[in-house]
Amino acid sequence: SEVEYRAEVGQNAYLPCFYTPAAPGNLVPVCWGKGACPVFECGNVVLRTDERDVNYWTSRYWLNGDFRKGDVSLTIENVTLADSGIYCCRIQIPGIMNDEKFNLKLVIKPAKVTPAPTRQRDFTAAFPRMLTTRGHGPAETQTLGSLPDINLTQISTLANELRDSRLANDLRDSGATIRIG
């Protein structure tokens, strides 16, 4: 089942996705699409990278992390209720059927009406409650049978909701990571 993330209307949503390049600058193409990951590619592509850089993007979707180091987490700016749904992060590893696919569910909640102004929150994300680690270390590492050189490391945190933009960097240490090479 999809990992669920939450954001409020008007905020920026953050959907984590990572891989570890085999060597600096040796990038693997990645696509983000709206809708569950299909057999190939991404459906309704909202952003794409190639071996060099981001080569397809639209106005509200961007990679704010260091994608050259494998942080291909998607930021959706100024979200609306229509942004709710499943998003696919696809790491397009060379070779037949080698792609890694992650389905992330984004739930957009109506903006809270607050009586007093509060500090702006840039990122909000909820993590599933059945998590296996309390820190930022790997919870488990499993070797993919068909890809002996690629490990899938799943990292999570127990926080139900990130409510402060200064936690964005912590968030980048969370999520799913593919190591290549």
């Epitope: 590619e41 309704n44 592509v45 080569n55 397809y56 993007w57 639209t58 106005s59 961007w62």
Partner: antibody, heavy 118, light 110 residues
């Protein structure tokens, strides 16, 4: 508000190279995520995307024009330039520069008429 | 022949709604949320109406709306006004970093 202004010769001889410049005001051509584009409107083919240069300097070209097209930029002058080589009368038309935050749409300049004739 | 297919002309009655279609493929309209619509009056540059399928450009009234279903995009104009008489073009990103346009639709307001 970003403003675009195309400039260049209105008349070019066949087999020569067409060179057009787009001067950008009200914003920098290196602004993150911006895409700076050339589009033309010809009597024969209607609106046709020619190519683009991204905020990063990376260029993209129409497959049908790629062999004849070059797009470059001068960040000190906040300009980007289209060069189209080996022109023929079929390249006659209005050439527009345009911009947007990504690939989702275009805000256009006013356009400049180019005629290819001997 | 244009890469995206639009009807050459449509007509609508003052105050009513008209819809212009734009047919593409899974490599452009169907695969990406980068459909845009433009209005061009005689002798002027195209003006952005809709970007990214359904987002109105700044200053565009909500009489103009965009949508997409499968490989076909649509522009709807409600409460037709005489000044809406113009040529309308669709465009879409296409795989491999290319952009394609429709052939244009001439809208006549009756």
């Amino acid at each position: 508000q970003v403003q675009l202004q195309e400039s260049g010769p209105g008349l070019v001889k066949p087999s020569q190279t067409l060179s057009l410049t787009c001067t950008v005001s009200g914003g920098s051509i290196t602004t993150n995520r911006y895409l700076w584009t050339w589009i033309r409107q010809t009597p024969g083919k209607g609106l046709e995307w020619v190519g683009a240069i991204a905020y990063s300097g990376r260029t993209y070209y129409s497959p049908s024009l790629k062999s004849r097209t070059s797009i470059s930029r001068d960040t000190s002058k906040n300009q980007f330039t289209l060069q189209l080589s080996s022109v023929t009368p079929e390249d006659t038309g209005v050439y527009y520069c345009a911009h947007f935050t990504g690939w989702g749409g275009y805000y256009w300049g006013q356009g400049t008429q180019v005629t290819v004739s001997s | 022949q244009s890469a995206l297919t639009q009807p050459p002309s449509v007509s609508g009655t003052l105050g009513k709604t008209v819809t212009i279609s734009c047919a593409g493929t899974s490599s452009d309209i169907g695969g990406y949320n980068s459909v845009s619509w433009y209005q061009q009056l005689p002798g002027t540059a195209p003006k952005l109406l809709i970007y990214e399928v359904n987002k109105r450009a700044s200053g565009i009234p909500d009489r103009f709306s965009g949508s997409k279903s499968g490989n076909t995009a649509s522009l709807s104009i409600s409460g037709l006004q005489s000044e809406d008489e113009a040529d309308y073009y669709c465009a879409s990103y296409r795989s491999a970093n290319n952009v394609v346009f429709g052939g244009g639709t001439k809208l006549t307001v009756l």
